[in-house]
Interface confidence: low
Protein backbone atom coordinates (compact mmCIF):
# COMPACT_ATOMS: atom_id res chain seq x y z
CA UNK A 1 0.00 0.00 0.00
CA UNK A 2 1.05 3.60 -0.42
CA UNK A 3 2.25 5.68 2.53
CA UNK A 4 0.61 8.91 3.65
CA UNK A 5 1.66 11.43 6.29
CA UNK A 6 -0.58 11.77 9.35
CA UNK A 7 -0.09 14.50 11.95
CA UNK A 8 -1.50 14.64 15.47
CA UNK A 9 -0.56 16.54 18.65
CA UNK A 10 2.11 15.06 20.87
CA UNK A 11 0.30 15.55 24.16
CA UNK A 12 -3.29 16.11 25.28
CA UNK A 13 -4.63 16.35 28.81
CA UNK A 14 -8.07 14.89 29.37
CA UNK A 15 -10.64 17.05 31.10
CA UNK A 16 -11.76 16.38 34.64
CA UNK A 17 -14.78 14.62 33.12
CA UNK A 18 -12.53 12.15 31.31
CA UNK A 19 -12.88 13.69 27.85
CA UNK A 20 -9.95 14.17 25.49
CA UNK A 21 -10.08 15.78 22.07
CA UNK A 22 -7.41 16.04 19.39
CA UNK A 23 -7.09 16.68 15.69
CA UNK A 24 -5.79 14.06 13.30
CA UNK A 25 -4.67 15.58 10.01
CA UNK A 26 -3.65 13.63 6.94
CA UNK A 27 -1.94 14.73 3.74
CA UNK A 28 -4.29 13.33 1.14
CA UNK A 29 -2.39 12.60 -2.08
CA UNK A 30 -5.58 12.35 -4.09
CA UNK A 31 -9.32 12.93 -4.03
CA UNK A 32 -10.50 10.31 -1.58
CA UNK A 33 -14.24 9.89 -1.19
CA UNK A 34 -14.20 7.24 1.51
CA UNK A 35 -11.89 7.46 4.51
CA UNK A 36 -11.46 5.12 7.45
CA UNK A 37 -10.11 6.47 10.72
CA UNK A 38 -8.97 4.14 13.48
CA UNK A 39 -7.77 5.12 16.94
CA UNK A 40 -5.26 2.71 18.45
CA UNK A 41 -4.00 2.77 22.03
CA UNK A 42 -0.45 1.74 22.78
CA UNK A 43 0.46 0.97 26.36
CA UNK A 44 3.20 -1.33 27.62
CA UNK A 45 3.98 -2.36 24.01
CA UNK A 46 0.43 -3.62 23.61
CA UNK A 47 -1.67 -2.06 20.83
CA UNK A 48 -5.45 -2.22 20.99
CA UNK A 49 -8.12 -0.70 18.79
CA UNK A 50 -10.13 1.93 20.63
CA UNK A 51 -12.59 2.80 17.88
CA UNK A 52 -12.94 3.11 14.14
CA UNK A 53 -15.21 4.87 11.69
CA UNK A 54 -15.57 4.93 7.94
CA UNK A 55 -17.01 8.05 6.40
CA UNK A 56 -17.69 9.63 3.04
CA UNK A 57 -15.92 12.94 2.50
CA UNK A 58 -18.19 15.77 3.51
CA UNK A 59 -20.26 13.54 5.78
CA UNK A 60 -20.12 12.99 9.52
CA UNK A 61 -18.08 10.22 11.06
CA UNK A 62 -20.28 7.49 12.41
CA UNK A 63 -18.81 5.35 15.15
CA UNK A 64 -20.69 2.40 16.57
CA UNK A 65 -23.42 3.31 19.05
CA UNK A 66 -21.45 1.92 22.00
CA UNK A 67 -18.19 3.56 20.94
CA UNK A 68 -16.36 5.86 23.32
CA UNK A 69 -15.34 7.99 20.34
CA UNK A 70 -17.10 10.73 18.44
CA UNK A 71 -15.76 12.88 15.69
CA UNK A 72 -16.26 15.36 12.93
CA UNK A 73 -14.40 15.83 9.68
CA UNK A 74 -13.41 18.95 7.81
CA UNK A 75 -11.36 18.55 4.67
CA UNK A 76 -8.29 16.51 5.56
CA UNK A 77 -8.77 16.97 9.29
CA UNK A 78 -10.63 14.72 11.68
CA UNK A 79 -11.55 16.09 15.09
CA UNK A 80 -11.66 13.15 17.46
CA UNK A 81 -13.11 13.06 20.95
CA UNK A 82 -12.65 10.16 23.32
CA UNK A 83 -14.83 10.09 26.39
CA UNK A 84 -15.17 8.02 29.54
CA UNK A 85 -11.44 8.04 30.16
CA UNK A 86 -9.95 7.20 33.53
CA UNK A 87 -6.43 7.40 34.89
CA UNK A 88 -5.77 3.81 33.90
CA UNK A 89 -6.50 4.80 30.28
CA UNK A 90 -3.49 7.08 30.11
CA UNK A 91 -1.42 6.08 27.11
CA UNK A 92 -0.38 6.78 23.55
CA UNK A 93 -3.35 7.12 21.21
CA UNK A 94 -2.41 6.62 17.58
CA UNK A 95 -4.44 7.88 14.66
CA UNK A 96 -4.51 5.57 11.65
CA UNK A 97 -6.03 6.87 8.42
CA UNK A 98 -6.88 4.80 5.34
CA UNK A 99 -8.01 6.28 2.06
CA UNK A 100 -10.32 3.50 1.03
CA UNK A 101 -11.87 4.67 -2.19
CA UNK A 102 -11.24 5.27 -4.98
CA UNK A 103 -8.00 3.38 -5.58
CA UNK A 104 -5.16 3.48 -5.00
CA UNK A 105 -5.32 2.68 -1.30
CA UNK A 106 -3.28 4.87 1.04
CA UNK A 107 -2.37 4.18 4.63
CA UNK A 108 -1.06 6.67 7.15
CA UNK A 109 -0.24 6.20 10.82
CA UNK A 110 0.46 9.10 13.13
CA UNK A 111 3.16 9.18 15.79
CA UNK A 112 0.52 9.14 18.48
CA UNK A 113 -0.93 11.54 21.02
CA UNK A 114 -0.02 10.92 24.64
CA UNK A 115 -3.26 11.39 26.54
CA UNK A 116 -2.91 11.97 30.25
CA UNK A 117 -5.95 11.25 32.36
CA UNK A 118 -6.13 12.25 36.00
CA UNK A 119 -9.03 10.94 38.00
CA UNK A 120 -10.73 13.79 39.85
CA UNK A 121 -10.29 13.88 43.59
CA UNK A 122 -13.46 12.86 45.35
CA UNK A 123 -15.31 15.81 46.82
CA UNK A 124 -14.67 16.06 50.57
CA UNK A 125 -17.67 15.42 52.74
CA UNK A 126 -19.19 18.71 53.71
CA UNK A 127 -21.02 19.39 56.92
CA UNK A 128 -23.98 21.55 56.22
Amino acid sequence: CKAMHVAQPAVVLASSRGIASFVCEYASPGKATEVRVTVLRQADSQVTEVCAATYMMGNELTFLDDSICTGTSSGNQVNLTIQGLRAMDTGLYICKVELMYPPPYYLGIGNGTQIYVIDPEPCPDSDF
Epitope: C1, K2, Y101, P103, P104, Y105
Partner: antibody
Framework: QLQLQESGPGLVKPSETLSLTCTVS??????????WGWIRQPPGKGLEWIGS???????YYNPSLKSRVTISVDTSKNQFSLELSSVAAADTAVYYC????????????????WGQGTLVTVSS | DIQMTQSPSSLSASVGDRVTITCRAS??????LNWYQQKPGKAPKLLIY???SLQSGVPSRFSGSGSGTDFTLTISSLQPEDFATYYC?????????FGQGTKLEIK
Protein backbone atom coordinates in the same frame (compact mmCIF):
# COMPACT_ATOMS: atom_id res chain seq x y z
CA GLN B 1 -25.90 -16.51 -0.43
CA LEU B 2 -25.68 -13.19 -2.24
CA GLN B 3 -27.26 -13.11 -5.68
CA LEU B 4 -27.32 -10.43 -8.37
CA GLN B 5 -29.79 -10.44 -11.24
CA GLU B 6 -29.70 -8.15 -14.26
CA SER B 7 -32.94 -7.22 -15.98
CA GLY B 8 -33.90 -5.03 -18.91
CA PRO B 9 -34.67 -5.14 -22.62
CA GLY B 10 -32.51 -7.38 -24.76
CA LEU B 11 -32.93 -5.22 -27.85
CA VAL B 12 -32.33 -1.49 -28.12
CA LYS B 13 -32.46 0.68 -31.21
CA PRO B 14 -29.45 2.78 -32.25
CA SER B 15 -29.35 6.28 -30.72
CA GLU B 16 -31.73 5.20 -27.94
CA THR B 17 -30.93 4.65 -24.26
CA LEU B 18 -30.04 1.27 -22.84
CA SER B 19 -31.47 0.75 -19.34
CA LEU B 20 -30.62 -2.14 -17.06
CA THR B 21 -31.35 -2.87 -13.42
CA CYS B 22 -29.44 -5.13 -11.05
CA THR B 23 -31.43 -6.56 -8.15
CA VAL B 24 -29.41 -7.70 -5.16
CA SER B 25 -30.79 -10.44 -2.91
CA UNK B 26 -29.30 -12.19 0.09
CA UNK B 27 -27.56 -9.04 1.28
CA UNK B 28 -28.00 -5.31 1.67
CA UNK B 29 -26.89 -2.91 -1.02
CA UNK B 30 -26.50 -0.34 1.77
CA UNK B 31 -23.55 -2.09 3.38
CA UNK B 32 -20.65 0.31 3.82
CA UNK B 33 -18.20 -2.46 2.93
CA UNK B 34 -19.12 -2.75 -0.72
CA UNK B 35 -19.44 -0.94 -4.01
CA TRP B 36 -21.50 -2.12 -6.94
CA GLY B 37 -20.36 -2.15 -10.51
CA TRP B 38 -21.21 -2.75 -14.15
CA ILE B 39 -18.97 -4.58 -16.59
CA ARG B 40 -19.68 -5.45 -20.21
CA GLN B 41 -18.35 -7.94 -22.73
CA PRO B 42 -18.98 -7.65 -26.48
CA PRO B 43 -19.56 -11.05 -28.13
CA GLY B 44 -16.29 -12.94 -28.44
CA LYS B 45 -14.29 -10.11 -26.87
CA GLY B 46 -12.84 -9.11 -23.53
CA LEU B 47 -14.22 -7.42 -20.43
CA GLU B 48 -14.68 -3.67 -19.99
CA TRP B 49 -15.41 -1.92 -16.71
CA ILE B 50 -18.24 0.60 -17.12
CA GLY B 51 -18.51 2.12 -13.67
CA SER B 52 -19.19 1.65 -9.97
CA UNK B 53 -21.48 3.16 -7.35
CA UNK B 54 -21.60 3.36 -3.56
CA UNK B 55 -24.90 3.09 -1.74
CA UNK B 56 -24.66 6.79 -0.90
CA UNK B 57 -24.77 7.56 -4.61
CA UNK B 58 -21.08 8.30 -5.24
CA UNK B 59 -20.25 7.18 -8.76
CA TYR B 60 -17.09 6.35 -10.69
CA TYR B 61 -17.23 5.99 -14.48
CA ASN B 62 -14.94 4.77 -17.20
CA PRO B 63 -13.84 7.98 -18.97
CA SER B 64 -14.37 6.32 -22.34
CA LEU B 65 -18.09 6.07 -21.58
CA LYS B 66 -18.56 8.83 -19.02
CA SER B 67 -20.47 11.22 -21.26
CA ARG B 68 -23.10 8.56 -21.96
CA VAL B 69 -23.30 6.63 -18.68
CA THR B 70 -25.44 7.11 -15.60
CA ILE B 71 -25.38 4.66 -12.71
CA SER B 72 -27.88 5.10 -9.89
CA VAL B 73 -28.89 3.23 -6.76
CA ASP B 74 -32.25 2.61 -5.08
CA THR B 75 -31.56 1.34 -1.58
CA SER B 76 -35.26 0.89 -0.82
CA LYS B 77 -35.48 -1.70 -3.59
CA ASN B 78 -31.96 -3.06 -3.08
CA GLN B 79 -31.21 -2.27 -6.71
CA PHE B 80 -28.76 -0.31 -8.80
CA SER B 81 -29.18 0.66 -12.42
CA LEU B 82 -27.27 1.45 -15.57
CA GLU B 83 -28.27 3.85 -18.32
CA LEU B 84 -26.22 4.18 -21.49
CA SER B 85 -27.42 6.83 -23.91
CA SER B 86 -26.98 7.22 -27.66
CA VAL B 87 -26.18 3.56 -28.16
CA ALA B 88 -24.63 2.15 -31.31
CA ALA B 89 -23.91 -1.34 -32.61
CA ALA B 90 -20.57 -1.25 -30.76
CA ASP B 91 -22.51 -1.24 -27.47
CA THR B 92 -23.89 -4.71 -28.19
CA ALA B 93 -22.57 -6.83 -25.35
CA VAL B 94 -23.33 -9.02 -22.38
CA TYR B 95 -23.78 -6.65 -19.45
CA TYR B 96 -22.84 -7.89 -15.99
CA CYS B 97 -23.51 -6.35 -12.61
CA UNK B 98 -21.18 -7.24 -9.77
CA UNK B 99 -20.29 -6.51 -6.18
CA UNK B 100 -17.00 -4.75 -5.51
CA UNK B 101 -15.47 -5.91 -2.24
CA UNK B 102 -12.61 -4.37 -0.31
CA UNK B 103 -10.00 -6.43 1.46
CA UNK B 104 -8.93 -4.57 4.58
CA UNK B 105 -5.21 -4.29 5.05
CA UNK B 106 -4.15 -4.89 1.46
CA UNK B 107 -5.99 -2.08 -0.26
CA UNK B 108 -7.33 -4.63 -2.71
CA UNK B 109 -10.68 -4.36 -4.44
CA UNK B 110 -12.27 -7.13 -6.43
CA UNK B 111 -15.48 -8.18 -8.11
CA UNK B 112 -16.47 -11.20 -6.04
CA UNK B 113 -20.15 -11.73 -6.87
CA TRP B 114 -21.52 -11.41 -10.39
CA GLY B 115 -24.89 -11.58 -12.05
CA GLN B 116 -25.26 -14.15 -14.81
CA GLY B 117 -25.18 -11.38 -17.41
CA THR B 118 -27.74 -10.17 -19.91
CA LEU B 119 -27.17 -9.80 -23.63
CA VAL B 120 -28.19 -6.45 -25.03
CA THR B 121 -28.27 -6.14 -28.81
CA VAL B 122 -28.28 -2.74 -30.46
CA SER B 123 -30.06 -3.02 -33.78
CA SER B 124 -32.82 -1.33 -35.71
CA ASP C 1 -5.38 4.61 -18.77
CA ILE C 2 -3.24 1.71 -17.64
CA GLN C 3 -2.96 -0.93 -20.36
CA MET C 4 -2.88 -4.57 -19.34
CA THR C 5 -1.24 -6.98 -21.77
CA GLN C 6 -1.67 -10.72 -21.30
CA SER C 7 0.44 -13.41 -22.87
CA PRO C 8 -0.06 -15.72 -24.50
CA SER C 9 -3.45 -14.88 -25.96
CA SER C 10 -4.14 -18.59 -26.38
CA LEU C 11 -2.53 -21.69 -25.03
CA SER C 12 -2.93 -25.44 -25.61
CA ALA C 13 -2.10 -27.75 -22.74
CA SER C 14 -2.89 -31.19 -21.38
CA VAL C 15 -4.41 -32.36 -18.11
CA GLY C 16 -1.67 -32.48 -15.50
CA ASP C 17 0.46 -29.80 -17.16
CA ARG C 18 1.85 -26.81 -15.31
CA VAL C 19 0.66 -23.64 -16.99
CA THR C 20 1.78 -20.03 -16.58
CA ILE C 21 -0.05 -16.95 -17.85
CA THR C 22 1.53 -13.52 -17.60
CA CYS C 23 0.06 -10.05 -17.37
CA ARG C 24 2.07 -6.87 -17.87
CA ALA C 25 0.91 -3.40 -16.84
CA SER C 26 1.92 -0.29 -18.80
CA UNK C 27 2.96 1.32 -15.49
CA UNK C 28 3.44 0.15 -11.94
CA UNK C 29 0.26 -1.02 -10.22
CA UNK C 30 1.90 -2.27 -7.00
CA UNK C 31 -0.02 -5.44 -6.10
CA UNK C 32 -3.41 -4.14 -7.19
CA LEU C 33 -4.15 -6.99 -9.58
CA ASN C 34 -6.81 -9.69 -9.71
CA TRP C 35 -7.19 -12.83 -11.83
CA TYR C 36 -10.51 -14.15 -13.13
CA GLN C 37 -11.58 -17.35 -14.86
CA GLN C 38 -14.43 -17.31 -17.35
CA LYS C 39 -16.15 -20.24 -18.98
CA PRO C 40 -18.36 -19.89 -22.09
CA GLY C 41 -21.75 -18.38 -21.29
CA LYS C 42 -20.83 -17.76 -17.66
CA ALA C 43 -19.81 -14.77 -15.59
CA PRO C 44 -16.15 -14.41 -14.61
CA LYS C 45 -15.08 -16.02 -11.36
CA LEU C 46 -12.52 -14.45 -9.01
CA LEU C 47 -9.44 -16.62 -8.49
CA ILE C 48 -6.73 -14.34 -7.09
CA TYR C 49 -6.84 -10.87 -5.53
CA UNK C 50 -4.01 -8.58 -4.40
CA UNK C 51 -1.75 -10.34 -6.93
CA UNK C 52 -1.18 -13.42 -4.82
CA SER C 53 -4.07 -14.02 -2.39
CA LEU C 54 -6.23 -17.03 -3.19
CA GLN C 55 -9.95 -16.36 -3.09
CA SER C 56 -11.88 -18.57 -0.67
CA GLY C 57 -13.04 -21.80 -2.30
CA VAL C 58 -10.54 -21.66 -5.16
CA PRO C 59 -8.34 -24.78 -5.48
CA SER C 60 -4.77 -24.40 -4.26
CA ARG C 61 -3.37 -25.41 -7.66
CA PHE C 62 -4.00 -21.78 -8.65
CA SER C 63 -1.43 -19.27 -7.51
CA GLY C 64 -0.50 -15.71 -8.35
CA SER C 65 2.71 -13.74 -8.06
CA GLY C 66 4.27 -10.48 -9.10
CA SER C 67 4.36 -6.82 -8.20
CA GLY C 68 4.85 -3.56 -10.04
CA THR C 69 4.31 -4.26 -13.71
CA ASP C 70 4.78 -8.02 -14.16
CA PHE C 71 2.37 -10.63 -12.84
CA THR C 72 1.90 -14.35 -13.24
CA LEU C 73 -0.96 -16.78 -12.80
CA THR C 74 0.16 -20.38 -12.41
CA ILE C 75 -1.90 -23.56 -12.50
CA SER C 76 0.32 -26.25 -11.03
CA SER C 77 -1.51 -29.26 -12.44
CA LEU C 78 -4.23 -28.66 -15.01
CA GLN C 79 -7.60 -30.27 -14.38
CA PRO C 80 -10.32 -30.75 -17.02
CA GLU C 81 -12.44 -27.99 -15.45
CA ASP C 82 -9.60 -25.46 -15.80
CA PHE C 83 -9.96 -25.07 -19.55
CA ALA C 84 -11.39 -21.56 -19.83
CA THR C 85 -10.40 -17.97 -20.54
CA TYR C 86 -8.39 -16.09 -17.93
CA TYR C 87 -8.35 -12.32 -17.40
CA CYS C 88 -6.22 -10.05 -15.25
CA UNK C 89 -7.66 -6.81 -13.84
CA UNK C 90 -5.83 -3.81 -12.42
CA UNK C 91 -7.46 -1.58 -9.82
CA UNK C 92 -4.53 0.65 -8.99
CA UNK C 93 -6.26 3.59 -10.63
CA UNK C 94 -9.34 4.47 -12.60
CA UNK C 95 -10.49 3.26 -14.97
CA UNK C 96 -10.22 -0.37 -13.93
CA UNK C 97 -8.76 -2.19 -16.92
CA PHE C 98 -8.74 -5.86 -17.88
CA GLY C 99 -6.21 -7.75 -19.91
CA GLN C 100 -7.43 -9.00 -23.27
CA GLY C 101 -7.68 -12.57 -21.98
CA THR C 102 -5.84 -15.85 -22.38
CA LYS C 103 -7.80 -18.78 -23.77
CA LEU C 104 -6.61 -22.08 -22.34
CA GLU C 105 -7.54 -25.00 -24.59
CA ILE C 106 -7.12 -28.75 -24.45
CA LYS C 107 -4.20 -30.06 -26.50
Amino acid sequence: QLQLQESGPGLVKPSETLSLTCTVSGGSISSSSYYWGWIRQPPGKGLEWIGSIYYSGSTYYNPSLKSRVTISVDTSKNQFSLELSSVAAADTAVYYCARVSYYYGSGSYYFDYWGQGTLVTVSS
Amino acid sequence: DIQMTQSPSSLSASVGDRVTITCRASQSISSYLNWYQQKPGKAPKLLIYAASSLQSGVPSRFSGSGSGTDFTLTISSLQPEDFATYYCLQHNSYPYTFGQGTKLEIK
